[in-house]
C-alpha cells in the first residue's frame, strides 16, 4: 500500500516474547498479528525497531504487568520508551509509572505510550522496564509500534 | 479534506453507548463529538467498525470502568480490540487488563488500546470488554477509533 | 518532510511544565525531545495547541500523576482533553478517570488520552487535569501533542 | 498452587525425534503464555520456542524448521515436538507458563543427543 515510491508507507508493529535475560529492554517477535511495512522499518536484535529514513514518526507502546506491592520494591512499576540515534547518547521519550497492586499473588494493570518524534536515519526506539519478569506476554497483552507521517 | 480522489481520508472515532444487552461486546453511536470521514469506514450494528479499503491502520480504544476486588469475580477486567476478517475466525489485536480496585463502592479506572494492523476489505473492528456493566459512558471517558495511514 | 507544499505535515508534541497558577489547565513547553512542525500548529500561552487548517488530527495526551486516597477528595483523578473552537464553547473529547492509589505516601499512575477529531481553522485544544498539584513532571512522563492526517 | 511436570525427554541419536510434554495442574488455559527454555552445561538459559492463547508462535532461529510447539487447552498441557535433532540441542529443557501474569517453572527433563 504505496503512497508512491518516493514516500512509501512505514510502519511496525511488533509483539512481546519472554527472555531468559535478565536486561531491562523488553524483547519482541515478528509473529501473531504483526506488521512489518517494508525494510526501511526492522526489528533488530529483538530489542529496537530501527528506521532507514528521517521523519516524524508516532511511535507507541503497550505493557500489561502484573506486580503485587510486598513482593516488589517500593519503587513504582515504569515503562520507558527510549531513543538511540546514530553518535548520541540514549535519551527517554516517555515513560510511565503505575505503583504496584496490592492484589495478590499479583494485581494486572496495563500502560499506554505514544508521541510524535523525529526521527534520524538509523535511529532506534526501544522499551525499558523496571522488571521485565512482571510483564504479561499472553495474545495482545504487551505491543510496540510505531507509524511514519 | 482528501488526499486526492483515489486516497481519501478514512477516519472514525465513535462514542460509547449504555446497552441492555448482555454481550460481552461494547456498544457504540455516531453521537456528541464523533468523526466518521465518508463511507469508506461504517458503524455496523452499533458495534463494530467496518473498512471498505485494505491497508495499514492505527486502530484505537479507550476504555473506563468503575469495579471493586470484593464484588467483582477474581479475574482482572479486560479489554479487547478483535478482528473479523471475511471468511477468517475473530483474532485477538490487543488487551489490556487491570485488577479490581479496593475502593468503595467501586474504583475508576481507564486503559488505552492502540496498534498499527493491516486490515482486509470488509474488515471489521470491535471491542470486547469482562463486564460491560462496569463501562463509564460519561462525556469522552470511552470511545473507539482508527485510521488510515 | 514535506508532502507537498499544499499539504505539509502538521505534529506537535510538547512537554509538561510545572506551575504555580493554580488552573486545572495544565501547562507545557517546548524543552527536551519536542517536536514542532511548522507555524501551522503553535503552543498558545503554554497550555494549548493551535491550529491553522481544517482537518482532521489524531490528539492525544499522557499525564502521570501521584495521589493518595486519604489526602486526596473522594472525586477519582480525572484528565480531560477539551477542545475550544473559535465561536463556540468548550467541549471535552476524552476523558479519562483513576481512582487514588491506597499507597502512601501516594501511588503513581499513568493515564493515556486520544482520538481522531475534525478541527477548525483557529481551534485549540488543551488538557485539563482535577489536581495539576498531583501531576508528575520528570522526563517523559506527561506529554501532550497532535498530528493532522 | 500451579504445577507443571515434564515428560519425553531421552537420550536419542543425530537425526531423530523426540516429543516433550508440559502438563499443568492448578491453572485453566484462559490468557497464557508457555513457552520451552533450554540449558546447555555452562550456557545461559534461552528460550527455543513459545505459544500464547490466541495461538501466536515464535522459535529460536536454531530450531526453526525443526522444531514445533503446540497446545491442547482442553488437556491443559503443552507439547514439543523435536526433528531432526543435532548434537548441539542437548540440554535441560525446562517448561515456563505465565497465567494471568503469574509464572510456574517445571524441573526440568533432560535431552541427551549422541550417536
Known amino acids: 500500500m504505496q503512497k508512491g515510491d518516493q514516500n512509501p508507507q512505514i510502519a511496525a508493529h511488533v509483539i512481546s516474547e519472554a527472555s531468559s535475560k535478565t536486561t531491562s529492554v523488553l524483547q519482541w517477535a515478528e509473529k501473531g498479528y504483526y506488521t512489518m511495512s517494508n525494510n526501511l522499518v526492522t526489528l533488530e536484535n529483538g530489542k529496537q525497531l530501527t528506521v532507514k529514513r528521517q521523519g516524524l514518526y508516532y511511535i507507541y507502546a503497550q505493557v500489561t504487568f502484573c506486580s503485587n506491592r510486598e513482593a516488589s520494591s517500593q519503587a513504582p512499576f515504569i515503562a520507558s520508551l527510549c531513543l538511540k540515534s546514530p553518535g548520541r547518547f540514549e535519551r527517554i521519550l516517555l515513560r510511565a509509572a503505575n505503583t504496584h497492586s496490592s492484589a495478590k499473588p499479583c494485581g494486572q494493570q496495563s500502560i499506554h505510550l505514544g508521541g510524535v518524534f523525529e526521527l534520524q536515519p538509523g535511529a532506534s526506539v526501544f522499551v525499558n522496564v523496571t522488571d521485565p519478569s512482571q510483564v504479561s506476554h499472553g495474545t495482545g497483552f504487551t505491543s510496540f509500534g510505531l507509524l511514519k507521517l | 479534506m482528501q488526499k486526492g480522489d483515489q486516497n481519501p481520508q478514512i477516519a472514525a472515532h465513535v462514542i460509547s453507548e449504555a446497552s441492555s444487552k448482555t454481550t460481552s461486546v461494547l456498544q457504540w453511536a455516531e453521537k456528541g463529538y464523533y468523526t466518521m470521514s465518508n463511507n469508506l469506514v461504517t458503524l455496523e450494528n452499533g458495534k463494530q467498525l467496518t473498512v471498505k479499503r485494505q491497508g495499514l491502520y492505527y486502530i484505537y480504544a479507550q476504555v473506563t470502568f468503575c469495579s471493586n476486588r470484593e464484588a467483582s469475580s477474581q479475574a482482572p477486567f479486560i479489554a479487547s480490540l478483535c478482528l473479523k476478517s471475511p471468511g477468517r475466525f475473530e483474532r485477538i489485536l490487543l488487551r489490556a487488563a487491570n485488577t479490581h480496585s479496593s475502593a468503595k463502592p467501586c474504583g475508576q479506572q481507564s486503559i488505552h488500546l492502540g496498534g498499527v494492523f493491516e486490515l482486509q476489505p470488509g474488515a471489521s473492528v470491535f471491542v470486547n470488554v469482562t463486564d460491560p456493566s462496569q463501562v463509564s459512558h460519561g462525556t469522552g471517558f470511552t470511545s473507539f477509533g482508527l485510521l488510515k495511514l | 518532510m514535506q508532502k507537498g507544499d499544499q499539504n505539509p505535515q502538521i505534529a506537535a508534541h510538547v512537554i509538561s511544565e510545572a506551575s504555580s497558577k493554580t488552573t486545572s489547565v495544565l501547562q507545557w513547553a517546548e524543552k527536551g525531545y519536542y517536536t514542532m512542525s511548522n507555524n501551522l500548529v503553535t503552543l498558545e500561552n503554554g497550555k494549548q495547541l493551535t491550529v491553522k487548517r481544517q482537518g482532521l488530527y489524531y490528539i492525544y495526551a499522557q499525564v502521570t500523576f501521584c495521589s493518595n486516597r486519604e489526602a486526596s477528595s473522594q472525586a477519582p483523578f480525572i484528565a480531560s482533553l477539551c477542545l475550544k473552537s473559535p465561536g463556540r464553547f468548550e467541549r471535552i473529547l476524552l476523558r479519562a478517570a483513576n481512582t487514588h492509589s491506597s499507597a502512601k505516601p501516594c501511588g503513581q499512575q499513568s493515564i493515556h488520552l486520544g482520538g481522531v477529531f475534525e478541527l477548525q481553522p483557529g481551534a485549540s485544544v488543551f488538557v485539563n487535569v482535577t489536581d495539576p498539584s498531583q501531576v508528575s513532571h520528570g522526563t517523559g512522563f506527561t506529554s501532550f501533542g497532535l498530528l493532522k492526517l | 498452587e500451579v504445577q507443571l511436570v515434564e515428560s519425553g525427554g531421552g537420550l536419542v541419536q543425530p537425526g531423530g525425534s523426540l516429543r516433550l510434554s508440559c502438563a499443568a495442574s492448578?491453572?485453566?488455559?484462559?490468557?497464557?503464555?508457555m513457552g520451552w527454555f533450554r540449558q546447555a552445561p555452562g550456557k545461559e538459559r534461552e528460550l527455543v520456542a513459545s505459544i500464547t492463547d490466541g495461538g501466536s508462535t515464535n522459535y529460536a532461529d536454531s530450531v526453526k524448521g525443526r522444531f514445533t510447539i503446540s497446545a491442547d487447552n482442553s488437556k491443559n498441557t503443552a507439547y514439543l515436538q523435536m526433528n531432526s535433532l543435532k548434537p548441539e540441542d542437548t540440554a535441560v529443557y525446562y517448561c515456563a507458563v505465565q497465567v494471568n501474569g503469574i509464572w510456574a517453572w517445571g524441573q526440568g527433563t533432560l535431552v541427551t543427543v549422541s550417536s
Open positions: 492448578g491453572l485453566t488455559f484462559s490468557s497464557y503464555w
